[in-house]
C-alpha cells in the first residue's frame, strides 16, 4: 500500500523518489503523475524527466533536489485540497517490465488558523544516511540484466525505517516537514 | 482527423502465419504508444500486444508471447503484427489502438480466421 | 491476473430511463479504470477514462465513478442510441485486462 504524506493548504508539499544512477550523467528517465501508477507510463504526467535533463513539467511542480544524482522527489508549490491524492514516481529503466514504480499518498489538511511556531528541522543533517544505497522490501537493489555496467538501488522512501520510530511521531505531532527521501 | 486502418486479415490453417498491417494518419504517430487488441466472434476484448513510441520496448499478453512479433515504421505511419504458429483460439477480429494504457482511437478491425 | 467482472451481462431498458452499469476487479485497481462503447459490427469507443473522466464527443448523461475494486459507469437518461455493449478495462496491474461486457437493450 502506498505511504501516506502530509502538508498543509498553502505550503509546499514533498514527495520523496530516489535512486542511484552508476555513474554522474547515466540518468534513468522518470515521470511522474497524478494518480496511481498504471501498467505503463505515468498517467496525467506532471513531470518528466529524460536521460538528461527535465523535459517536461506543469507549473507548480519541480525537482528541488539534484536530479542528476538520482533526487526526482517532487516538490508540490503552495498546495490546495484539490491536490490531495495519489502520484506516481516511476523510475523508467531500459528493459521489459523493469520500471520502479511507487505510489505516494498526499493528504492535505486545512491551514492552521493561527499556527503555532514549530521550527523546521532539516530532515538531512538529523538523517545524514538518508541517501545510503540501503535496500528495504520492495526497495532491494536490482541489477539489471539488460544493462550490466548499471545498478539500481530504488529507494522509495524513508519511512520504512521511520513508520514505528518516535521520531516521526514527534516530527509528525509538531507540524513539521517530514523530507522523507 | 485521426484514422487506423487495418489490413492483411485473411482465412489461414493451423500453423500458419499472417502478417497484419495497421495504417495511421491524422496525427503524429511517431509520439504514440500502439497497441493491438482482438475480440473472438461473439466474444469480449483481449490486450494482445503493444510497443512504445520508439519501438524500445514491446509487451505481449502471455498467449501470443514466442509467437506474435510486433514492430513499427514511423517513415511509414505504421504499425505491424506478425503472426506465426497460428492456433484455432487466435481467431478474432484484430483492432490497432492508439494508447499504452487505454485506447483513444481503433481501426475498425480485420478478421483473422484460423481452420483446417 | 486482474479479473475484471461486468454486471449485469444484459441490462433491459427503456429509452429516458437511467441505466447503471456495475464493473469489480479482483484486486485493487486505484482509479486506473476505462469504459467502451461498442456498437454492432463497430470497433469500440473510448468513453471514461481514469474512473470518471468522459472522453471527447460523448455528452455529460454518461458519468464514471469508483475506485479501487468497485466502478459503475451511469447513463442518466438512455437514448436510442446508447443501446450498445460495455466494456471496462483496468489497467493497473500486468496484463492490462477488459471485463466482459454489459449489453444494455432496449426494454
Known amino acids: 500500500s502506498e505511504v501516506e504524506y502530509r502538508a498543509e493548504v498553502g505550503q509546499n508539499a514533498y514527495l520523496p523518489c530516489f535512486y542511484t544512477p552508476a555513474a554522474p550523467g547515466n540518468l534513468v528517465p522518470v515521470c511522474w503523475g497524478k494518480g496511481a501508477c498504471p501498467v505503463f507510463e505515468c498517467g496525467n504526467v506532471v513531470l518528466r524527466t529524460d536521460e538528461r535533463d527535465v523535459n517536461y513539467w506543469t507549473s507548480r511542480y519541480w525537482l528541488n533536489g539534484d536530479f542528476r544524482k538520482g533526487d526526482v522527489s517532487l516538490t508540490i508549490e503552495n498546495v490546495t485540497l484539490a491536490d490531495s491524492g495519489i502520484y506516481c514516481c516511476r523510475i523508467q529503466i531500459p528493459g521489459i517490465m523493469n520500471d520502479e514504480k511507487f505510489n505516494l499518498k498526499l493528504v492535505i489538511k486545512p491551514a492552521k488558523v493561527t499556527p503555532a511556531p514549530t521550527r523546521q528541522r532539516d530532515f538531512t543533517a538529523a538523517f545524514p544516511r538518508m541517501l545510503t544505497t540501503r535496500g528495504h522490501g520492495p526497495a532491494e537493489t536490482q541489477t539489471l540484466g539488460s544493462l550490466p555496467d548499471i545498478n539500481l538501488t530504488q529507494i522509495s522512501t524513508l519511512a520504512n525505517e521511520l513508520r514505528d520510530s518516535r521520531l516521526a511521531n514527534d516530527l509528525r505531532d509538531s507540524g513539521a516537514t517530514i523530507r522523507i527521501g | 482527423e485521426v484514422q487506423l486502418v487495418e489490413s492483411g486479415g485473411d482465412l489461414v490453417q493451423p500453423g500458419g502465419s499472417l502478417r497484419l498491417s495497421c495504417a495511421a494518419s491524422?496525427?503524429?504517430?511517431?509520439?504514440?504508444?500502439m497497441t493491438w487488441v482482438r475480440q473472438a466472434p461473439g466474444r469480449g476484448l483481449e490486450w494482445v500486444a503493444n510497443i512504445k513510441q520508439d519501438g524500445s520496448a514491446k509487451y505481449y499478453v502471455d498467449s501470443v508471447k514466442g509467437r506474435f512479433t510486433l514492430s513499427r515504421d514511423d517513415a511509414k505511419n505504421s504499425l505491424y503484427l506478425q503472426m506465426n504458429s497460428l492456433r484455432a483460439e487466435d481467431t478474432a477480429v484484430y483492432y490497432c489502438?492508439?494508447?499504452?494504457?487505454?485506447?483513444?482511437?481503433w481501426g475498425q478491425g480485420t478478421l483473422v480466421t484460423v481452420s483446417s | 491476473e486482474t479479473v475484471m467482472t461486468q454486471s449485469p451481462a444484459t441490462l433491459s431498458v427503456s429509452p429516458g430511463e437511467r441505466a447503471t452499469l456495475s464493473c469489480r476487479a479482483n484486486q485493487n485497481v486505484y482509479s486506473n479504470l476505462a469504459w467502451y462503447q461498442q456498437k454492432p459490427g463497430q470497433a469500440p469507443r473510448l468513453l471514461i477514462y481514469?474512473?470518471?473522466t468522459r472522453a471527447t464527443g460523448f455528452p455529460a448523461r454518461f458519468s464514471g465513478s469508483g475506485s479501487g475494486t468497485e466502478f459503475t459507469l451511469t447513463i442518466s437518461s438512455l437514448q436510442s442510441e446508447d443501446f450498445a455493449v460495455y466494456y471496462c478495462q483496468q489497467y493497473n496491474n500486468w496484463p492490462l485486462t477488459f471485463g466482459g461486457g454489459t449489453k444494455v437493450e432496449i426494454k
Open positions: 489502438a492508439r494508447g499504452s494504457n487505454w485506447f483513444d482511437y
Open positions: 481514469d474512473a470518471s
Open positions: 491524422g496525427f503524429t504517430f511517431s509520439t504514440y504508444w
